[in-house]
């Protein structure tokens, strides 16, 4: 059997790894596979990076081709540019290196193209059809730091076996990315496991110093302790557990008191029983059983809505009578026509018009019945002042090759680590759009085309978008890399209407940003089923203060000081919430609990396929997420009002891929 095609392999430097996966995949499948592991298709932008790719690929057969992260849309030829109109899957065209097999030839570039690297010879770049399943693909993984490979010791039974965060197992690494595990087997029989962790003094290093295979006490195999081993004065060993865990009966292993806790929503370690239960915002503990949570009916609160109010389990929505429109504050109503806004129809058409057969695309869209269920690592919010619309996406990259952000990036505050905070939830106002981008976002489902943003024009200083970059959300808190949090202070809310906080499930892992409540995340990904109201469900509307039974499980609604995406129930023609393009209740906006001054809404279309991993995880792994009601009818189309004075400057990212009126699923943009 071909050694080249046997197993995936990787080459790592101090800040990034390239991995070769010899698996036959189309471009889209390869892109998804890299993303699922927390990386991206390889983007060798410098001669040095290309050299690392060359050494990894080696001398394969001439017939072998490997996808790299370059894609070009139809009619996007720019032959005079180094990348010829191709864009890295990270959304930009920055490069200091190319390796095209042929000189650029003039032509109309009628179709979408993707780039594959030859496994033989000079590893030249070839362009071709993105739907071909080539022989493999190259992924790239960026990280904060790396640990050097362990030196072999005299007492070792064999070389250390390393497991990377992207699940590659090998003995052949020079550097191990942050979060890697090293397993060392000693001749004496016992072994040692080490983790590449963040060091208190800065940087990263192995969780234990050598020698690993000598002596007694805690040295071999951590003294048999699952977490911490303590060598007592008298020489014997005792085990301790990290915060939030308790020592099991065997005195060695550690158990999570929340693992078996009967909390309906959230569990926090500690308290007399070893755990305490909490409810999400908008819920309160049941009087007869503090483990259960019951809905709070905000519609009973005087003045919560000016006219009509509908209470959902976990949320509420204000409505206006016929002839009135919901104002931007989400509470007040004004006569219809008083707040006209730009519809998205023309913009959607423009974003999507690339000359392909519309009729066929309509059919493809009908076949794609699942609807949009997740947006990898992208959160949206409209600003109070409509800016030149831009979307930033921050992939993980080697530190020396950080891609250019399409706007100046703030340099403060300093990096923070995720703190353990008291368990509470709050929503704070924000007057600017916020983008949260996880370095390791979750893979989109098979039914969902992933979105790759294009490069966008720079924003003025007034409209800069804060970025929160997160790394390795699946690692235990003790081993989390530092998290960079940068933001601008909000504009003074002096003349802004009051904000109503609404209910929502906890949506983000705590380690993704210092803004969220504490979480300990186990080594597996958490699957969250995000709920939506079925489009055929007409919420019962009551006048202010009227009692309303729960209508749908955990409907997600946001009210902030920023201009809102409207929510219009499809079966309520007499009610209007705004003059902008409608969004069905199934496509609602949810917010994470925040302890920092920002409310982070996410556009969350409904209908996640079963077991689909969401990029948005619960705040605690023990949070129980509700199941999504299944929808049999076609997914409602969605229109997004983009607050841009110039539609041509709008981003292609979300508008093109899934939010404009005529968006169909195809593979033009991944």
């Amino acid at each position: 059997q071909d050694p080249w095609a046997a197993e995936p392999r990787a080459a790592c430097g101090p800040s990034s790894c390239y991995a070769l996966f010899p698996r036959r995949r189309t471009f889209l499948e390869a892109w998804r596979a890299c993303r699922e592991l927390g990386g991206d298709l390889a983007t060798p932008r410098t001669p040095e990076e290309a050299q690392r790719v060359d050494s990894l690929v080696g001398a394969g057969p001439a017939s072998r081709l490997l996808w790299i992260g370059l894609q070009r849309q139809a009619r996007q030829c720019q032959l005079q540019r180094p990348l010829r109109g191709f864009t890295w899957t990270t959304g930009d065209q920055d490069t200091a290196f190319t390796n095209w097999a042929q000189p650029a030839s003039g032509g109309p570039c009628p179709a979408q193209r993707c780039v594959a690297l030859e496994a033989s010879g000079e590893h030249r770049w070839l362009e071709g059809s993105c739907t071909l399943a080539v022989d493999g693909y190259l992924c790239q993984f960026g990280f904060e730091g790396a640990c050097p490979a362990l030196q072999d010791e005299a007492g070792q039974a064999g070389p250390a076996v390393y497991t990377t965060p992207f699940h590659l197992v090998s003995t052949e690494f020079e550097w191990l990315p942050f979060g890697s595990v090293a397993a060392v087997q000693c001749q004496a029989g016992r072994g040692a496991s080490l983790l590449c962790v963040k060091q208190p003094e800065g940087g990263v290093g192995w969780s234990r110093a050598g020698p690993l295979c000598l002596g007694t006490g805690c040295s071999p195999d951590n003294g048999g302790c699952e977490h911490e081993c303590v060598e007592e004065v008298d020489g014997h060993v005792s085990c301790r557990c990290t915060e939030g865990f308790r020592l099991a009966a065997d005195g060695r292993s550690c158990e999570d008191p929340c693992a078996q806790a009967p909390c309906e929503q959230q569990c926090e370690p500690g308290g007399p029983q070893g755990y305490s239960c909490h409810c999400r915002l908008g819920f309160r503990p049941a009087e007869d059983d503090p483990h259960r949570c019951v809905d709070t009916d905000e519609c009973q609160i005087a003045g919560v809505c000016q006219q009509m109010c509908v209470n959902y389990v976990g949320g509420f929505e204000c409505y206006c009578s016929e002839g009135h429109e919901l104002e931007a504050d989400g509470i007040s109503c004004s006569p219809a026509g008083a707040m006209g806004a730009q519809a998205s129809q023309d913009l959607g058409d423009e974003l999507l018009d690339d000359g392909e057969d519309e009729e066929d695309e309509d059919e493809a869209w009908k076949a794609f019945n699942g609807g949009w269920t997740e947006m990898p690592g992208i959160l949206w919010m409209e600003p109070t002042q409509p800016p030149d619309f831009a979307l930033a996406y921050r992939p993980s990259f080697p530190e020396d090759r950080e891609p250019q952000i399409p706007y100046p990036e703030p340099t403060w505050p300093p990096p923070l680590s995720a703190p353990r905070v008291p368990y509470h939830s709050s929503v704070l106002s924000v007057t600017r759009p916020v983008v949260v981008s996880a370095t390791h976002p979750t893979l989109p489902s098979a039914h969902q085309p992933p979105v790759i943003p294009a490069t966008h024009p720079a924003l003025s200083r007034d409209h800069q978008i804060p970025v929160i970059a997160a790394n390795y959300p699946d690692l235990p808190s003790a081993y989390q890399p530092g998290i960079l949090s940068v933001s601008h202070s909000a504009q003074p809310p002096a003349h802004q209407p009051p904000m109503i906080s609404t209910k929502y499930p906890e949506l983000f892992p705590a380690h993704q940003s210092p803004m969220f409540p504490d979480t300990r995340v186990a080594g597996t990904q958490t699957t969250t089923h995000l709920p939506g109201i079925p489009p055929n469900h007409a919420p019962l509307v009551t006048t202010l203060g009227a009692q309303l039974p729960p209508q749908a499980p955990d409907a997600l609604v946001l009210r902030t000081q920023a201009t809102q995406l409207p929510i219009i129930p499809t079966a309520q023609p007499s009610l209007t919430t705004t003059s902008r393009s409608p969004v069905s209740p199934a496509h609602q906006i949810s917010v994470p609990a925040a302890t920092q001054p920002a409310a982070l809404p996410t556009l969350l279309p409904s209908q996640s396929p079963t077991n689909q991993t969401s990029p948005i995880s619960p705040t605690h792994p023990h949070s129980k997420a509700p199941q999504i009601p299944r929808e049999d009818g076609p997914s409602p189309k969605l229109a997004l009002w983009l607050p841009s004075p110039a539609p041509t400057a709008a981003p292609t990212a979300l508008g093109e891929a899934g939010l404009a009126e005529h968006s169909q699923r195809d593979d033009r943009w991944l």
Epitope: A5, S63, W100, P110, G128, S129, T131, L132, A133, A364
Partner: antibody, heavy 124, light 108 residues
């Protein structure tokens, strides 16, 4: 220049196994996938499957799964097709064809060279 | 399986005429489409690959276009030696390669 030459018995009895040979020359055999395609008399082309001589990787048309076997001998630059339990429906001209890899800076998997074909009649 | 529906099944045209053959894929195949020419009693020959690229040595009167599901093959000026059957073929690898039914081109 690149050449592909099919050979095999022109007549096979029903329920027997059809065996064909494709000899390649003029290029590095292990660098290109070999396809087998057939064409019943007066009808269109039907893909049977392919084999990659580099690593013996095969992909077959579901229609022939269980009946078809493809093999290669890299020392003699030869590909083999075996189709078992044949019936009169398997009467056809059988072609071997080479899958291209790249042309003028494009990668592509179309079949760039074909053999002249070998007529196999299944009859008792 | 991906079906390739080719039309017309046959056509007659005069020398110098423009001839167009269409092929529709049952699902998106990107640009992984080839056009082959088969003259009577001979093996097929590759004319167009990747939907629109002319193969080496193929006269410029032959051209192809399209992507996704709809593809067109054109002979800009029919010549006597072009009398043949023309096939479209998709080769996305998933799950198999398939051919159109063929279009027989004759001269009036």
């Amino acid at each position: 220049q690149v050449q592909l030459q099919e050979s095999g018995p022109g007549l096979v009895r029903p329920s027997q196994t059809l065996s064909l040979t494709c000899t390649a020359s003029g290029y590095t055999f292990t660098d290109y996938v070999i396809h087998w395609v057939r064409q019943p008399p007066g009808r269109g082309l039907e893909w049977i499957g392919y084999i990659n001589p580099y690593d013996d990787d095969t992909t077959y048309n579901q229609k022939f799964k269980g009946r078809v076997t493809m093999l290669v001998d890299t020392s003699s630059n030869t590909a083999y097709l075996r189709l078992s339990s044949v019936t009169a429906e398997d009467t056809a001209v059988y072609y071997c064809a080479r899958r291209g890899n790249s042309y003028d800076g494009y990668f592509d998997y179309s079949m760039d060279y074909w053999g002249q074909g070998s007529l196999v009649t299944v009859s008792s | 399986d991906i079906q390739m529906t080719q039309s017309p099944s046959s056509l007659s045209a005069s020398v110098g005429d423009r001839v167009t053959i269409t092929c529709r894929a049952s699902q998106n195949v990107g640009t992984a489409v080839a056009w082959l020419q088969q003259t009577p009693g001979k093996a097929p020959k590759l004319l167009i690959y990747s939907a629109s690229n002319r193969y080496t040595g193929v006269p410029s009167r032959f051209s192809g276009s399209g992507s996704g599901t709809d593809f067109t093959f054109t002979i800009s000026s029919l010549q006597p030696e072009d009398i043949a059957t023309y096939y479209c073929q998709q080769y996305t690898n998933y799950p198999m390669y398939t051919f159109g039914q063929g279009t027989k081109v004759q001269i009036k």
